[in-house]
Protein backbone atom coordinates (compact mmCIF):
# COMPACT_ATOMS: atom_id res chain seq x y z
CA UNK A 1 0.00 0.00 0.00
CA UNK A 2 1.29 3.48 -0.83
CA UNK A 3 2.20 5.79 2.01
CA UNK A 4 3.63 9.25 2.51
CA UNK A 5 7.42 9.30 2.39
CA UNK A 6 7.64 12.28 4.73
CA UNK A 7 6.61 13.00 8.28
CA UNK A 8 5.33 16.58 8.00
CA UNK A 9 2.17 16.89 5.90
CA UNK A 10 0.00 19.84 4.96
CA UNK A 11 -3.76 20.04 4.50
CA UNK A 12 -6.11 22.66 3.18
CA UNK A 13 -9.89 22.92 3.43
CA UNK A 14 -10.56 24.09 -0.11
CA UNK A 15 -14.22 24.91 0.47
CA UNK A 16 -16.74 24.61 3.30
CA UNK A 17 -20.10 22.92 3.68
CA UNK A 18 -22.94 25.39 4.30
CA UNK A 19 -24.37 22.87 6.78
CA UNK A 20 -21.99 23.98 9.55
CA UNK A 21 -20.10 26.98 10.87
CA UNK A 22 -16.66 27.35 9.31
CA UNK A 23 -14.96 27.33 12.70
CA UNK A 24 -16.69 24.04 13.55
CA UNK A 25 -15.45 22.50 10.31
CA UNK A 26 -11.91 23.75 11.02
CA UNK A 27 -12.00 22.33 14.54
CA UNK A 28 -13.40 18.97 13.40
CA UNK A 29 -10.64 18.47 10.83
CA UNK A 30 -7.99 19.56 13.33
CA UNK A 31 -9.29 16.89 15.74
CA UNK A 32 -9.60 14.28 12.97
CA UNK A 33 -5.95 14.78 11.97
CA UNK A 34 -4.98 14.67 15.65
CA UNK A 35 -6.52 11.20 15.95
CA UNK A 36 -3.86 9.94 13.51
CA UNK A 37 -0.97 12.12 14.69
CA UNK A 38 -1.50 10.89 18.26
CA UNK A 39 -0.54 7.34 17.28
CA UNK A 40 2.13 8.00 14.59
CA UNK A 41 5.14 10.26 14.01
CA UNK A 42 3.06 12.21 11.45
CA UNK A 43 2.48 15.93 11.93
CA UNK A 44 -0.13 18.03 10.09
CA UNK A 45 -0.17 21.74 9.29
CA UNK A 46 -3.14 23.65 7.89
CA UNK A 47 -2.62 25.85 4.81
CA UNK A 48 -4.96 28.66 3.81
CA UNK A 49 -3.78 28.91 0.21
CA UNK A 50 -1.77 26.99 -2.37
CA UNK A 51 -1.63 23.25 -2.94
CA UNK A 52 -1.49 21.07 0.18
CA UNK A 53 -0.63 17.38 0.40
CA UNK A 54 -4.21 16.68 1.50
CA UNK A 55 -6.85 18.88 -0.15
CA UNK A 56 -10.29 18.66 1.45
CA UNK A 57 -13.38 19.63 -0.50
CA UNK A 58 -17.17 19.35 -0.43
CA UNK A 59 -18.88 18.70 -3.77
CA UNK A 60 -22.03 17.41 -5.46
CA UNK A 61 -22.23 14.67 -8.10
CA UNK A 62 -19.57 14.90 -10.82
CA UNK A 63 -16.82 17.03 -9.36
CA UNK A 64 -13.68 16.51 -11.45
CA UNK A 65 -12.39 13.08 -10.50
CA UNK A 66 -13.30 9.62 -11.81
CA UNK A 67 -15.88 8.90 -9.08
CA UNK A 68 -19.21 10.75 -9.07
CA UNK A 69 -21.12 11.29 -5.86
CA UNK A 70 -24.54 9.68 -5.75
CA UNK A 71 -26.74 12.15 -3.87
CA UNK A 72 -27.97 11.81 -0.29
CA UNK A 73 -27.09 8.50 1.36
CA UNK A 74 -24.97 5.84 -0.33
CA UNK A 75 -21.41 7.06 -0.72
CA UNK A 76 -20.74 9.77 1.87
CA UNK A 77 -17.19 10.64 0.83
CA UNK A 78 -14.10 9.22 -0.82
CA UNK A 79 -10.40 9.78 -0.46
CA UNK A 80 -7.27 9.06 -2.45
CA UNK A 81 -4.27 7.10 -1.31
CA UNK A 82 -0.99 9.00 -0.74
CA UNK A 83 0.81 10.64 -3.64
CA UNK A 84 1.01 13.85 -5.66
CA UNK A 85 -1.90 15.88 -7.01
CA UNK A 86 -5.31 14.40 -6.29
CA UNK A 87 -3.64 11.53 -4.43
CA UNK A 88 -4.07 12.11 -0.70
CA UNK A 89 -7.11 14.34 -1.16
CA UNK A 90 -10.46 13.81 0.58
CA UNK A 91 -13.83 14.67 -1.00
CA UNK A 92 -17.12 14.88 0.92
CA UNK A 93 -20.56 14.57 -0.72
CA UNK A 94 -22.34 17.90 -0.22
CA UNK A 95 -25.67 16.12 -0.69
CA UNK A 96 -25.28 14.76 2.84
CA UNK A 97 -26.34 16.84 5.83
CA UNK A 98 -23.05 17.29 7.71
CA UNK A 99 -23.27 17.78 11.47
CA UNK A 100 -21.25 17.61 14.67
CA UNK A 101 -23.90 15.50 16.40
CA UNK A 102 -25.74 12.18 15.96
CA UNK A 103 -28.19 13.79 13.53
CA UNK A 104 -27.45 13.77 9.81
CA UNK A 105 -23.93 12.54 9.05
CA UNK A 106 -21.26 13.23 11.65
CA UNK A 107 -18.41 15.00 9.89
CA UNK A 108 -15.76 14.06 12.45
CA UNK A 109 -16.35 10.31 12.13
CA UNK A 110 -16.34 10.38 8.33
CA UNK A 111 -13.28 12.66 8.33
CA UNK A 112 -11.27 10.27 10.52
CA UNK A 113 -12.22 7.43 8.15
CA UNK A 114 -11.37 9.34 4.97
CA UNK A 115 -8.12 10.69 6.36
CA UNK A 116 -7.20 7.10 7.14
CA UNK A 117 -7.42 6.48 3.38
CA UNK A 118 -5.45 9.68 2.72
CA UNK A 119 -2.70 8.21 4.86
CA UNK A 120 -2.77 4.84 3.07
CA UNK A 121 -5.24 2.69 5.00
CA UNK A 122 -7.68 0.42 3.20
CA UNK A 123 -11.10 -0.64 4.44
CA UNK A 124 -11.20 -3.05 7.36
CA UNK A 125 -13.54 -5.99 7.83
CA UNK A 126 -13.55 -5.39 11.59
CA UNK A 127 -16.82 -3.64 12.55
CA UNK A 128 -15.05 -1.92 15.47
CA UNK A 129 -12.57 -0.26 13.14
CA UNK A 130 -13.07 3.33 11.99
CA UNK A 131 -11.96 1.99 8.58
CA UNK A 132 -14.99 -0.32 8.39
CA UNK A 133 -16.77 0.71 5.17
CA UNK A 134 -20.22 1.22 6.73
CA UNK A 135 -21.03 4.42 8.62
CA UNK A 136 -22.31 4.14 12.17
CA UNK A 137 -22.56 6.85 14.80
CA UNK A 138 -20.13 6.95 17.73
CA UNK A 139 -19.82 9.70 20.29
CA UNK A 140 -16.94 11.91 19.00
CA UNK A 141 -16.06 13.10 22.51
CA UNK A 142 -15.27 9.54 23.64
CA UNK A 143 -14.02 8.25 20.28
CA UNK A 144 -10.90 6.06 20.29
CA UNK A 145 -9.18 4.23 17.44
CA UNK A 146 -9.48 0.46 17.64
CA UNK A 147 -6.38 -1.66 18.25
CA UNK A 148 -6.70 -2.77 14.61
CA UNK A 149 -6.58 0.82 13.35
CA UNK A 150 -3.54 1.63 15.47
CA UNK A 151 -1.72 -1.51 14.36
CA UNK A 152 -2.50 -0.82 10.69
CA UNK A 153 -1.45 2.83 10.68
CA UNK A 154 1.69 2.03 12.68
CA UNK A 155 2.59 -0.68 10.17
CA UNK A 156 2.87 2.18 7.66
CA UNK A 157 4.43 4.91 9.80
CA UNK A 158 5.50 3.41 13.11
CA UNK A 159 4.70 4.60 16.62
CA UNK A 160 5.01 8.24 17.75
CA UNK A 161 8.61 9.33 17.97
CA UNK A 162 9.67 10.43 21.43
CA UNK A 163 12.33 13.10 21.05
CA UNK A 164 15.67 11.88 22.42
CA UNK A 165 16.32 13.20 25.92
CA UNK A 166 18.40 16.36 25.69
CA UNK A 167 21.42 17.06 27.79
CA UNK A 168 21.87 20.62 28.98
CA UNK A 169 22.33 22.85 25.93
CA UNK A 170 25.84 23.83 26.87
CA UNK A 171 29.30 23.32 25.49
CA UNK A 172 30.61 19.77 26.00
CA UNK A 173 32.63 19.01 29.15
CA UNK A 174 36.35 19.58 28.78
CA UNK A 175 37.02 15.87 29.38
CA UNK A 176 35.04 15.18 26.20
CA UNK A 177 37.30 17.49 24.22
CA UNK A 178 40.48 16.11 25.73
CA UNK A 179 39.67 12.54 24.80
CA UNK A 180 41.02 10.92 21.68
CA UNK A 181 37.52 10.13 20.57
CA UNK A 182 36.67 8.03 17.52
CA UNK A 183 33.22 7.30 16.11
CA UNK A 184 31.69 4.12 14.69
CA UNK A 185 29.49 5.95 12.14
CA UNK A 186 28.52 9.54 11.39
CA UNK A 187 25.63 10.78 9.25
CA UNK A 188 23.18 13.60 8.82
CA UNK A 189 19.60 12.88 9.87
CA UNK A 190 17.53 15.74 8.52
CA UNK A 191 19.08 18.91 9.88
CA UNK A 192 20.96 17.07 12.63
CA UNK A 193 24.21 15.11 12.64
CA UNK A 194 24.31 11.75 14.44
CA UNK A 195 27.61 10.42 15.83
CA UNK A 196 27.28 6.70 16.64
CA UNK A 197 29.46 5.10 19.31
CA UNK A 198 28.89 1.68 20.87
CA UNK A 199 25.31 1.56 22.22
CA UNK A 200 24.48 5.27 21.99
CA UNK A 201 24.84 8.32 19.76
CA UNK A 202 25.43 12.01 20.15
CA UNK A 203 23.36 14.33 17.99
CA UNK A 204 23.49 18.00 17.38
CA UNK A 205 22.40 20.77 15.07
CA UNK A 206 25.42 22.19 13.22
CA UNK A 207 26.17 25.65 14.57
CA UNK A 208 24.28 25.06 17.81
CA UNK A 209 26.24 24.66 21.06
CA UNK A 210 23.84 22.00 22.39
CA UNK A 211 25.12 18.44 22.32
CA UNK A 212 22.57 15.71 22.95
CA UNK A 213 23.02 12.04 23.71
CA UNK A 214 20.66 9.09 23.63
CA UNK A 215 20.90 5.32 23.53
CA UNK A 216 20.15 3.61 20.22
CA UNK A 217 17.71 1.24 21.90
CA UNK A 218 15.67 4.04 23.49
CA UNK A 219 14.77 5.51 20.12
CA UNK A 220 14.91 2.32 18.00
CA UNK A 221 14.48 -0.80 20.14
CA UNK A 222 14.91 -3.09 17.13
CA UNK A 223 18.32 -1.66 16.11
CA UNK A 224 21.41 -3.22 17.67
CA UNK A 225 24.29 -1.43 19.33
CA UNK A 226 27.64 -1.15 17.59
CA UNK A 227 26.44 0.35 14.30
CA UNK A 228 29.42 0.35 11.91
CA UNK A 229 28.23 2.52 9.00
CA UNK A 230 25.33 4.87 8.27
CA UNK A 231 24.09 7.14 5.54
CA UNK A 232 21.01 9.22 4.85
CA UNK A 233 19.05 9.89 1.66
CA UNK A 234 17.47 13.11 2.87
CA UNK A 235 15.13 13.59 -0.10
CA UNK A 236 13.42 10.31 0.85
CA UNK A 237 13.76 10.73 4.64
CA UNK A 238 15.64 7.43 4.66
CA UNK A 239 18.44 6.45 7.04
CA UNK A 240 20.42 3.25 6.44
CA UNK A 241 22.33 1.59 9.28
CA UNK A 242 24.88 -1.22 8.86
CA UNK A 243 26.29 -3.80 11.22
CA UNK A 244 28.27 -6.84 10.10
CA UNK A 245 26.41 -8.55 7.22
CA UNK A 246 23.07 -6.81 7.86
CA UNK A 247 21.52 -3.42 7.25
CA UNK A 248 18.40 -1.64 8.48
CA UNK A 249 16.23 1.06 6.92
CA UNK A 250 14.82 3.84 9.11
CA UNK A 251 12.07 5.69 7.25
CA UNK A 252 10.91 9.03 8.69
CA UNK A 253 12.70 8.02 11.90
CA UNK A 254 10.69 4.78 12.02
CA UNK A 255 12.34 1.37 11.45
CA UNK A 256 10.96 -0.18 8.28
CA UNK A 257 9.41 -3.68 8.49
CA UNK A 258 11.10 -6.57 6.61
CA UNK A 259 14.51 -5.46 7.89
CA UNK A 260 17.32 -6.22 8.57
CA UNK A 261 18.37 -7.39 5.12
CA UNK A 262 21.61 -8.93 3.95
CA UNK A 263 24.27 -6.56 2.63
CA UNK A 264 24.78 -9.08 -0.18
CA UNK A 265 21.39 -8.09 -1.60
CA UNK A 266 23.03 -4.74 -2.42
CA UNK A 267 25.62 -6.47 -4.58
CA UNK A 268 28.58 -6.98 -2.25
CA UNK A 269 30.76 -10.01 -2.84
CA UNK A 270 30.92 -12.78 -0.24
CA UNK A 271 34.37 -11.59 0.86
CA UNK A 272 32.80 -8.48 2.46
CA UNK A 273 31.95 -9.29 6.07
CA UNK A 274 31.19 -5.75 7.21
CA UNK A 275 31.13 -2.17 5.94
CA UNK A 276 33.56 0.24 7.62
CA UNK A 277 31.83 3.42 6.50
CA UNK A 278 29.22 4.66 4.04
CA UNK A 279 28.20 8.00 2.61
CA UNK A 280 25.50 9.12 0.18
CA UNK A 281 26.44 11.84 -2.29
CA UNK A 282 23.18 13.54 -3.35
CA UNK A 283 24.80 15.34 -6.28
CA UNK A 284 25.87 12.05 -7.83
CA UNK A 285 23.01 9.98 -6.41
CA UNK A 286 25.58 7.38 -5.37
CA UNK A 287 26.43 5.66 -2.10
CA UNK A 288 30.12 5.07 -1.41
CA UNK A 289 30.84 2.06 0.79
CA UNK A 290 34.30 1.80 2.34
CA UNK A 291 35.56 -1.72 3.09
CA UNK A 292 39.17 -2.09 4.27
CA UNK A 293 41.40 -0.74 1.46
CA UNK A 294 38.61 -0.65 -1.13
CA UNK A 295 35.41 1.21 -1.82
CA UNK A 296 32.23 0.20 -3.62
CA UNK A 297 29.78 2.51 -5.39
CA UNK A 298 26.02 1.95 -5.36
CA UNK A 299 23.52 3.67 -7.68
CA UNK A 300 20.38 4.52 -5.69
CA UNK A 301 18.31 5.25 -8.80
CA UNK A 302 18.93 1.87 -10.37
CA UNK A 303 19.24 0.13 -7.00
CA UNK A 304 22.37 -1.62 -8.26
CA UNK A 305 26.04 -1.72 -7.36
CA UNK A 306 27.99 -0.01 -10.14
CA UNK A 307 30.10 -2.32 -12.31
CA UNK A 308 33.92 -2.41 -12.03
CA UNK A 309 33.86 -2.07 -8.24
CA UNK A 310 35.47 -2.39 -5.74
CA UNK A 311 38.31 0.06 -6.38
CA UNK A 312 41.26 1.10 -4.24
CA UNK A 313 40.55 4.00 -1.89
CA UNK A 314 44.10 5.36 -2.14
CA UNK A 315 43.95 5.51 -5.95
CA UNK A 316 40.58 7.22 -6.31
CA UNK A 317 40.54 9.32 -3.11
CA UNK A 318 43.96 11.03 -3.21
CA UNK A 319 45.31 11.76 0.24
CA UNK A 320 43.06 9.23 1.98
CA UNK A 321 44.69 6.20 3.53
CA UNK A 322 42.67 3.29 4.86
CA UNK A 323 41.29 2.38 7.34
CA UNK A 324 38.19 4.59 7.54
CA UNK A 325 35.91 4.69 10.61
CA UNK A 326 33.10 6.88 9.30
CA UNK A 327 32.23 9.31 6.51
CA UNK A 328 29.85 12.27 6.66
CA UNK A 329 28.50 14.26 3.69
CA UNK A 330 28.01 17.89 4.69
CA UNK A 331 27.86 21.00 2.51
CA UNK A 332 29.32 19.27 -0.56
CA UNK A 333 32.30 17.90 1.33
CA UNK A 334 33.06 14.46 2.73
CA UNK A 335 34.30 14.35 6.32
CA UNK A 336 36.37 11.18 6.62
CA UNK A 337 36.84 10.06 10.23
CA UNK A 338 39.96 8.09 11.14
CA UNK A 339 40.57 7.59 14.84
CA UNK A 340 40.80 10.91 16.68
CA UNK A 341 41.00 12.90 13.42
CA UNK A 342 38.89 13.70 10.40
CA UNK A 343 39.82 14.82 6.92
CA UNK A 344 37.69 17.34 5.06
CA UNK A 345 37.68 16.11 1.47
CA UNK A 346 36.45 18.00 -1.61
CA UNK A 347 35.00 15.41 -4.03
CA UNK A 348 34.86 17.92 -6.89
CA UNK A 349 38.61 18.64 -6.86
CA UNK A 350 39.43 15.22 -5.35
CA UNK A 351 41.67 16.53 -2.60
CA UNK A 352 41.91 16.83 1.20
CA UNK A 353 41.22 20.43 2.20
CA UNK A 354 41.59 20.24 6.02
CA UNK A 355 42.64 17.98 8.87
CA UNK A 356 40.57 18.38 12.04
CA UNK A 357 40.04 16.66 15.37
CA UNK A 358 37.09 14.30 15.12
CA UNK A 359 35.41 16.21 17.98
CA UNK A 360 35.60 19.58 16.19
CA UNK A 361 31.83 19.36 15.55
CA UNK A 362 31.28 19.68 19.30
CA UNK A 363 33.04 22.99 19.65
CA UNK A 364 36.30 21.41 20.81
Amino acid sequence: RSRWMKRYLTYRIYNYTPDMKREDVDYIFQKAFQVWSDVTPLRFRKLHKDEADIMILFAFGAHGDFNYFDGKGGTLAHAFYPGPGIQGDAHFDEAETWTKSFQGTNLFLVAVHELGHSLGLQHSNNPKSIMYPTYRYLNPSTFRLSADDIRNIQSLYGAPVKPPSLTKPSSPPSTFCHQSLSFDAVTTVGEKIFFFKDWFFWWKLPGSPATNITSISSIWPSIPSGIQAAYEIESRNQLFLFKDEKYWLINNLVPEPHYPRSIYSLGFSASVKKVDAAVFDPLRQKVYFFVDKHYWRYDVRQELMDPAYPKLISTHFPGIKPKIDAVLYFKRHYYIFQGAYQLEYDPLFRRVTKTLKSTSWFGC
Epitope: R3, N67, A79, F80, G85, I86, E114, H117
Partner: antibody, heavy 120, light 108 residues
Framework: EVQLLESGGGLVQPGGSLRLSCAAS???????NMWWVRQAPGKGLEWVS?????????GYADSVKGRFTISRDNSKNTLYLQMNSLRAEDTAVYYC?????????????WGQGTLVTVSS | QSALTQPPSVSVAPGQTARITCGGN??????VHWYQQKSGQAPVLVVY???DRPSGIPERFSGSNSGNTATLTISRVEAGDEADYYC???????????FGGGTKLTVL
Protein backbone atom coordinates in the same frame (compact mmCIF):
# COMPACT_ATOMS: atom_id res chain seq x y z
CA GLU B 1 -16.74 10.67 -19.67
CA VAL B 2 -12.95 10.62 -19.35
CA GLN B 3 -11.20 11.00 -22.70
CA LEU B 4 -7.56 11.27 -23.73
CA LEU B 5 -6.79 12.05 -27.35
CA GLU B 6 -3.19 11.95 -28.59
CA SER B 7 -2.02 13.71 -31.74
CA GLY B 8 1.19 14.85 -33.42
CA GLY B 9 2.60 11.48 -34.45
CA GLY B 10 3.95 10.79 -37.91
CA LEU B 11 7.00 9.93 -39.97
CA VAL B 12 10.23 11.73 -39.12
CA GLN B 13 13.87 11.26 -40.10
CA PRO B 14 16.53 10.23 -37.53
CA GLY B 15 17.76 13.31 -35.69
CA GLY B 16 14.46 15.09 -36.28
CA SER B 17 11.89 16.39 -33.80
CA LEU B 18 8.20 15.94 -33.10
CA ARG B 19 5.80 17.34 -30.54
CA LEU B 20 3.02 15.09 -29.29
CA SER B 21 -0.12 16.46 -27.65
CA CYS B 22 -2.72 14.79 -25.48
CA ALA B 23 -6.05 16.58 -25.06
CA ALA B 24 -7.83 15.58 -21.85
CA SER B 25 -11.51 15.95 -20.99
CA UNK B 26 -14.05 14.62 -18.51
CA UNK B 27 -11.97 15.28 -15.37
CA UNK B 28 -10.09 18.07 -13.61
CA UNK B 29 -6.82 17.78 -15.49
CA UNK B 30 -4.87 19.99 -13.05
CA UNK B 31 -5.40 17.50 -10.21
CA UNK B 32 -3.68 14.58 -11.89
CA ASN B 33 -0.26 13.13 -12.59
CA MET B 34 0.02 12.40 -16.31
CA TRP B 35 2.14 9.78 -18.05
CA TRP B 36 3.53 9.02 -21.48
CA VAL B 37 4.03 5.31 -22.22
CA ARG B 38 5.17 3.87 -25.54
CA GLN B 39 5.04 0.53 -27.30
CA ALA B 40 7.35 -0.38 -30.18
CA PRO B 41 5.77 -2.60 -32.87
CA GLY B 42 5.40 -6.13 -31.52
CA LYS B 43 7.10 -5.18 -28.24
CA GLY B 44 6.09 -4.51 -24.64
CA LEU B 45 5.06 -1.34 -22.82
CA GLU B 46 7.82 1.11 -21.90
CA TRP B 47 7.27 4.02 -19.57
CA VAL B 48 8.61 7.25 -21.07
CA SER B 49 7.84 10.09 -18.70
CA UNK B 50 5.50 11.51 -16.07
CA UNK B 51 4.65 14.98 -14.85
CA UNK B 52 3.11 16.13 -11.58
CA UNK B 53 -0.11 18.19 -11.63
CA UNK B 54 1.64 21.56 -11.23
CA UNK B 55 4.29 20.62 -13.81
CA UNK B 56 7.00 21.22 -11.23
CA UNK B 57 8.17 17.63 -10.99
CA UNK B 58 8.98 15.34 -13.90
CA GLY B 59 10.57 11.95 -14.44
CA TYR B 60 12.08 10.32 -17.52
CA ALA B 61 13.18 6.87 -18.59
CA ASP B 62 16.94 6.68 -19.07
CA SER B 63 16.41 5.90 -22.76
CA VAL B 64 14.89 9.34 -23.44
CA LYS B 65 16.50 11.54 -20.78
CA GLY B 66 18.03 14.67 -22.29
CA ARG B 67 16.16 14.24 -25.57
CA PHE B 68 12.47 14.32 -24.57
CA THR B 69 10.69 16.97 -22.52
CA ILE B 70 7.28 16.52 -20.92
CA SER B 71 5.13 19.57 -20.19
CA ARG B 72 1.51 20.49 -19.62
CA ASP B 73 -0.83 23.44 -20.01
CA ASN B 74 -3.49 23.14 -17.32
CA SER B 75 -5.46 26.03 -18.80
CA LYS B 76 -5.82 24.03 -22.04
CA ASN B 77 -6.16 20.59 -20.40
CA THR B 78 -3.29 19.41 -22.59
CA LEU B 79 -0.22 17.27 -22.05
CA TYR B 80 2.80 17.53 -24.36
CA LEU B 81 5.89 15.51 -25.22
CA GLN B 82 8.63 17.33 -27.12
CA MET B 83 10.85 14.72 -28.77
CA ASN B 84 14.23 15.81 -30.12
CA SER B 85 17.18 13.91 -31.63
CA LEU B 86 14.85 11.08 -32.57
CA ARG B 87 16.29 7.63 -33.23
CA ALA B 88 14.99 4.56 -35.04
CA GLU B 89 14.45 2.87 -31.67
CA ASP B 90 11.96 5.62 -30.70
CA THR B 91 9.55 4.22 -33.28
CA ALA B 92 6.44 3.27 -31.30
CA VAL B 93 2.82 3.99 -30.49
CA TYR B 94 2.84 6.69 -27.81
CA TYR B 95 0.05 6.64 -25.24
CA CYS B 96 -0.84 9.24 -22.67
CA UNK B 97 -2.34 7.85 -19.48
CA UNK B 98 -3.83 8.96 -16.17
CA UNK B 99 -4.45 7.02 -12.96
CA UNK B 100 -6.40 7.49 -9.76
CA UNK B 101 -6.08 5.37 -6.63
CA UNK B 102 -8.95 6.01 -4.24
CA UNK B 103 -11.08 4.36 -1.59
CA UNK B 104 -13.66 3.84 -4.33
CA UNK B 105 -11.16 1.67 -6.17
CA UNK B 106 -8.33 2.27 -8.63
CA UNK B 107 -9.03 3.53 -12.11
CA UNK B 108 -6.79 4.18 -15.09
CA UNK B 109 -7.44 5.68 -18.50
CA TRP B 110 -5.32 5.51 -21.63
CA GLY B 111 -5.63 7.27 -24.96
CA GLN B 112 -5.74 5.21 -28.14
CA GLY B 113 -2.18 6.22 -28.98
CA THR B 114 -0.39 8.04 -31.79
CA LEU B 115 2.20 6.32 -33.98
CA VAL B 116 5.68 7.82 -34.29
CA THR B 117 7.87 6.36 -37.04
CA VAL B 118 11.54 7.33 -37.18
CA SER B 119 13.03 6.27 -40.48
CA SER B 120 15.17 7.61 -43.28
CA GLN C 1 16.64 -4.97 -19.93
CA SER C 2 13.68 -4.69 -17.55
CA ALA C 3 14.20 -5.08 -13.81
CA LEU C 4 10.88 -6.97 -13.71
CA THR C 5 10.94 -10.46 -15.24
CA GLN C 6 7.83 -12.09 -16.72
CA PRO C 7 7.50 -15.37 -18.63
CA PRO C 8 7.02 -14.60 -22.35
CA SER C 9 3.97 -16.83 -22.61
CA VAL C 10 1.47 -18.80 -20.54
CA SER C 11 -1.09 -21.20 -22.02
CA VAL C 12 -4.18 -22.47 -20.26
CA ALA C 13 -7.37 -24.31 -21.14
CA PRO C 14 -10.75 -22.55 -20.73
CA GLY C 15 -12.11 -22.89 -17.19
CA GLN C 16 -8.66 -23.49 -15.71
CA THR C 17 -6.55 -21.09 -13.64
CA ALA C 18 -3.75 -19.02 -15.17
CA ARG C 19 -0.91 -17.69 -13.06
CA ILE C 20 1.40 -15.03 -14.45
CA THR C 21 4.47 -14.17 -12.42
CA CYS C 22 6.53 -11.02 -12.16
CA GLY C 23 9.97 -11.40 -10.60
CA GLY C 24 12.05 -8.62 -9.13
CA ASN C 25 14.50 -8.06 -6.29
CA UNK C 26 12.45 -7.62 -3.08
CA UNK C 27 9.35 -6.90 -5.17
CA UNK C 28 7.28 -7.96 -2.15
CA UNK C 29 8.10 -4.62 -0.50
CA UNK C 30 6.73 -2.64 -3.48
CA UNK C 31 3.29 -2.00 -4.95
CA VAL C 32 2.69 -3.95 -8.15
CA HIS C 33 0.05 -3.07 -10.75
CA TRP C 34 -1.11 -5.29 -13.63
CA TYR C 35 -2.38 -4.29 -17.07
CA GLN C 36 -4.21 -6.28 -19.73
CA GLN C 37 -3.69 -5.36 -23.38
CA LYS C 38 -5.78 -6.99 -26.05
CA SER C 39 -4.59 -6.96 -29.64
CA GLY C 40 -4.77 -3.51 -31.22
CA GLN C 41 -6.13 -1.87 -28.06
CA ALA C 42 -4.80 0.38 -25.32
CA PRO C 43 -3.87 -1.29 -22.01
CA VAL C 44 -6.42 -1.65 -19.19
CA LEU C 45 -5.59 -1.67 -15.47
CA VAL C 46 -6.82 -5.00 -14.03
CA VAL C 47 -5.11 -5.14 -10.62
CA TYR C 48 -3.69 -2.26 -8.61
CA UNK C 49 -1.46 -2.26 -5.54
CA UNK C 50 -0.82 -6.02 -5.55
CA UNK C 51 -4.41 -7.14 -5.09
CA ASP C 52 -6.97 -4.30 -5.56
CA ARG C 53 -9.38 -4.60 -8.48
CA PRO C 54 -10.74 -1.56 -10.34
CA SER C 55 -14.51 -1.37 -10.77
CA GLY C 56 -15.66 -3.35 -13.78
CA ILE C 57 -12.87 -5.94 -13.53
CA PRO C 58 -14.25 -9.44 -12.79
CA GLU C 59 -13.50 -11.09 -9.44
CA ARG C 60 -11.74 -13.83 -11.42
CA PHE C 61 -8.72 -11.50 -11.54
CA SER C 62 -6.66 -11.40 -8.35
CA GLY C 63 -3.12 -10.58 -7.37
CA SER C 64 -0.59 -11.37 -4.68
CA ASN C 65 2.94 -10.22 -3.91
CA SER C 66 5.62 -11.46 -1.55
CA GLY C 67 9.35 -12.04 -1.50
CA ASN C 68 10.78 -11.71 -4.99
CA THR C 69 7.62 -12.61 -6.93
CA ALA C 70 4.28 -10.95 -7.66
CA THR C 71 1.55 -13.08 -9.22
CA LEU C 72 -1.54 -12.29 -11.27
CA THR C 73 -4.08 -15.09 -11.00
CA ILE C 74 -6.96 -15.47 -13.46
CA SER C 75 -9.40 -18.17 -12.37
CA ARG C 76 -11.98 -19.80 -14.64
CA VAL C 77 -10.17 -18.47 -17.70
CA GLU C 78 -12.34 -17.42 -20.66
CA ALA C 79 -11.45 -16.99 -24.33
CA GLY C 80 -11.87 -13.21 -23.87
CA ASP C 81 -8.99 -13.17 -21.38
CA GLU C 82 -6.51 -13.88 -24.18
CA ALA C 83 -4.19 -10.85 -24.15
CA ASP C 84 -0.78 -9.57 -23.15
CA TYR C 85 -0.36 -8.89 -19.42
CA TYR C 86 2.18 -6.48 -17.96
CA CYS C 87 3.28 -5.92 -14.37
CA UNK C 88 4.41 -2.46 -13.34
CA UNK C 89 6.01 -0.90 -10.28
CA UNK C 90 5.89 2.75 -9.32
CA UNK C 91 7.04 4.06 -5.99
CA UNK C 92 6.51 7.60 -4.66
CA UNK C 93 10.06 7.57 -3.42
CA UNK C 94 11.78 6.97 -6.74
CA UNK C 95 11.52 8.78 -10.03
CA UNK C 96 11.32 5.75 -12.28
CA UNK C 97 8.45 3.60 -13.44
CA UNK C 98 9.21 0.08 -14.63
CA PHE C 99 7.11 -2.33 -16.69
CA GLY C 100 7.74 -6.04 -16.95
CA GLY C 101 8.45 -7.45 -20.40
CA GLY C 102 4.90 -8.76 -20.77
CA THR C 103 3.32 -12.21 -20.86
CA LYS C 104 1.14 -13.45 -23.72
CA LEU C 105 -1.78 -15.46 -22.30
CA THR C 106 -3.09 -18.01 -24.79
CA VAL C 107 -6.41 -19.71 -24.13
CA LEU C 108 -6.21 -23.16 -25.73
Amino acid sequence: EVQLLESGGGLVQPGGSLRLSCAASGFTFSWYNMWWVRQAPGKGLEWVSYIYPSGGNTGYADSVKGRFTISRDNSKNTLYLQMNSLRAEDTAVYYCAVFEYSSSGPQGYWGQGTLVTVSS
Amino acid sequence: QSALTQPPSVSVAPGQTARITCGGNNIGTKSVHWYQQKSGQAPVLVVYDNSDRPSGIPERFSGSNSGNTATLTISRVEAGDEADYYCQVWDNSIDHVVFGGGTKLTVL
